[in-house]
């Protein structure tokens, strides 16, 4: 007798692991034999779909290799034309060991910003995600949280947050670990110790000290009056992410010295600055103060001008008298490169004998100033034009430093050789006589304010600088 279909074993929920086989059974009693069709989520499964196997006249549906996308409601429908069609449905739950689909990556972040380390997972049951920092489980707090997605969010990143991280995804079927990633916390350059301002005497040595920190460790550069420091020695040391820079300066002019700490964050830089002023107390003191000692000149610049074994006065109002006086001459000497060939040797002789004055040894070593007449010979005869230009520059403040003020004597304040021949020093290198003077073109409209003395005559008929040393 014809019999309407009856499903004797309704479909049940099937749990299956990915890549495993899953089978639904739909046992049907009927006469004549029914046609059985299968749907997944109400979509017909085609008989020729190679991912499935349908056997036992359609009563067995086998998924040959389960994928996570096979999750859903499977229904079988039986119909033999007698009575109505019957249906039974069951769920396929695809069980999956945890899998990390978006692992964390290395992150560089600036202190104080927000960092997010991703960790997106798959799995069924849904994995729980936790994080490990170093070798220990990471504890959440008001700044550190594991998001619903599994990502790790750190607010207001601190230096101590730096380290190695990995995420762990866990469910009843297993555990998955991400690779270890590094969180690097970068810190803007910051100055810990700023250089201090100093008020020092001309020729002093001063050490400016600047300490900075940051991640990466910053570099320190020094700026003098807006330009890179051109002289002085810099000593640096780095310890525990702190850089210590010491700039040793030989002070010959006032200045603004700036310590700049710089570090790089990707393509951007962060900088911190601190400045100190160096001012010079009593500019004129080195020339007025007679404290010092006599010693042989052993420098370079005045070698050809001073007598080989000349005793010169070294002024102890400078921290390093010899070096300070040598630097004074050196700097002034450079200014002389542009003067006329007539003026230059005379000016060099004047400079050297003024800065490295002849020294009279004794209980109190005493500098012997240049005789006024020799100074005036240079000022009003050999270097008249240049002297006027220099005085003009001085009034207009065009000199780079006040050093030239110390380099050029004020002739009127020097003793005359007519007062006391032993109280002042001649310039033995002004080897000319009155005849030779006639060969020089007049350089000034005014007559020299003093008779040029009879200076030691020379065999040459023109002005020359001679290495020989003769005193009259």
């Amino acid at each position: 007798l014809p019999k309407a279909p009856v499903i004797t074993t309704p479909l049940e929920t099937v749990d299956a692991l990915v890549e495993e086989v899953a089978t639904f059974m739909c046992a049907v009693e009927s006469y004549p034999q029914p046609e059985i069709s299968w749907t997944r989520n109400k979509i017909l499964i085609k008989l020729f779909d190679t991912r499935y196997s349908i056997r036992e006249n359609g009563q067995l549906l086998t998924i040959l290799s389960v994928e996570d996308s096979d999750d859903g409601i499977y229904c079988c429908t039986a119909n033999n034309g007698v009575g109505g069609a019957v249906e039974s449905c069951g769920a396929l739950q695809v069980k999956m060991k945890p899998k990390i689909t978006r692992p964390p990556i290395n992150v560089k972040i600036i202190e104080g910003l927000k960092a997010v380390l991703p960790c997106t997972t798959m799995g069924n049951p849904k994995p729980s995600v936790s994080w490990i920092k170093g070798d220990s489980p990471l504890r959440e707090n008001s700044r550190i949280a594991v998001l619903e997605s599994g990502s790790l969010r750190i607010h207001n990143v601190q230096k101590e947050d730096a380290g190695q991280y990995r995420c762990v995804a866990k469910n009843s079927l297993g555990t998955a670990y991400s690779k270890v990633v590094k969180l690097e916390v970068e810190v803007f350059a910051r100055i810990l110790r700023a250089p201090e301002s100093h008020n020092v005497t001309f020729g002093s040595f001063v050490t400016l000290h600047c300490t900075a920190t940051g991640i990466p460790v910053p570099t320190i550069t020094w700026i003098e009056n807006g330009n890179a420091v051109s002289s002085g020695s810099i000593q640096e040391s780095v310890k525990d992410r702190v850089i210590d820079s010491r700039l040793q300066l030989f002070i010959t002019k006032p200045g603004l010295y700036t310590c700049i700490a710089t570090n790089k964050h990707g393509e951007k830089f962060s900088t911190a600055k601190a400045a100190a002023t160096i001012s010079i107390a009593e500019w004129s003191k080195p020339q007025k103060d007679n404290k010092g000692y006599c010693a042989q000149y052993r420098g370079e610049v005045c070698n050809a001008v001073l007598a080989k074994d000349a005793l010169v006065f070294l002024n102890t109002s400078y921290a390093d008298p010899e070096e300070a006086q040598e630097l004074l001459v050196h700097t002034a000497w450079n200014e002389l490169k542009v003067v006329s060939p007539v003026c230059r040797p005379a000016a060099e002789a004047l400079l050297c004998n003024h800065i490295f004055q002849e020294c009279s040894p004794g209980v109190v070593p005493t500098p012997i100033p240049i005789c006024r007449e020799y100074c005036l010979a240079v000022k009003e005869l050999f270097c008249a034009k240049e002297w006027l230009v220099m005085e003009e520059k001085t009034h207009r403040g065009l000199y780079r430093s006040e050093m030239h003020l110390l380099s050029v004597p004020e002739c009127s304040k020097l003793p005359s050789m007519h007062w006391d021949p032993t109280a002042c020093a001649r310039l033995p290198h002004l080897d000319y006589n009155k005849e030779n003077l006639k060969t020089f073109p007049p350089m000034t409209s005014s007559k020299p304010s003093v008779d040029i003395p009879n200076l030691p005559s020379s065999s040459s008929s023109s002005f020359s600088v001679s290495p020989t040393y003769s005193m009259t």
């Epitope: 002289s231 010693a295 370079e300 070698n303 390093d320 010899e322």
Partner: antibody
Framework: EVQLLESGGGLVQPGGSLRLSCAAS????????MSWVRQAPGKGLEWVSA????????YYKESVKGRFTISRDNSKNTLYLQMNSLRAEDTAVYYC??????????????WGQGTLVTVSS | QTVVTQEPSFSVSPGGTVTLTCGLS?????????PDWYQQTPGQAPRTLIY???SRHSGVPDRFSGSILGNKAALTITGAQADDESDYYC????????????FGGGTKLTVL
């Protein structure tokens, strides 16, 4: 930080030649006089040669005059000592030393670690 | 040829004061010799203590001082410490027709 790094030392036969170099960093090289000082094994220090910051003059110990030549290349921050006609008594550690200022004879305020020159047959 | 002379060795007790001298075989040491003093420990490069008679090099403790005593340059160490045990050399600028720099033979200082 002031650094002086000597190189060029080694074993050489009597009558041979060597050129020592000293690479300087951490200071404005042209502003400072430089010197070579040597120290024979187990002996004291012996000044060999000096040159001011400008490189304009050179000075030598009497026993090396005519055999040794000091020079400097301020653009390369390097000091040199060319040693010719070497003798057994030139065997020593050769130190490159920085002067405290531009003067060739200022105090020696920074020293390299030295390079050993051995003159032997 | 003028020789620069130093005591070959000297000993001092910890906390004591010692004065090392530097003279010339003929003549006196004066400020024109710009006496410098250097300290050298075995296997190390020398270090500057004093330059131009009495100027202390930066970073040198004020226990070290330089002077001219009579016809010699002198280095005085007050409150000697164990790590002052070193060789001490003086250096003199010499001028006799040509410029020269000459070291003394060195003094081995022992802190007992």
């Amino acid at each position: 930080e002031v650094q002086l790094l000597e190189s060029g030392g080694g074993l050489v036969q009597p009558g041979g030649s060597l050129r020592l170099s000293c690479a300087a960093s951490g200071f404005t090289f042209s502003d400072y006089g430089m010197s070579w000082v040597r120290q024979a094994p187990g002996k004291g220090l012996e000044w060999v040669s000096a040159i001011p910051g400008s490189g304009g003059s050179t000075y030598y110990k009497e026993s090396v005059k005519g055999r040794f030549t000091i020079s400097r290349d301020n653009s390369k921050n390097t000091l040199y000592l060319q040693m010719n006609s070497l003798r057994a008594e030139d065997t020593a550690v050769y130190y490159c030393a920085k002067r405290s200022g531009r003067i060739a004879f200022g105090a020696l305020d920074a020293w390299g670690q030295g390079t050993l020159v051995t003159v032997s047959s | 040829q003028t020789v620069v002379t130093q005591e070959p060795s000297f000993s001092v007790s910890p906390g004591g004061t010692v004065t090392l001298t530097c003279g010339l075989s003929s003549g006196s040491v004066t400020s024109s010799n710009y006496p410098d003093w250097y300290q050298q420990t075995p296997g190390q490069a020398p270090r500057t203590l004093i330059y131009s008679t009495d100027s202390r090099h930066s970073g040198v403790p004020d226990r070290f001082s330089g002077s001219i005593l009579g016809n010699k340059a002198a280095l005085t160490i007050t409150g000697a410490q164990a790590d002052d045990e070193s060789d001490y050399y003086c250096g003199l600028y010499m001028y006799s027709g040509s410029k020269n720099y000459v070291f003394g033979g060195g003094t081995k200082l022992t802190v007992l």
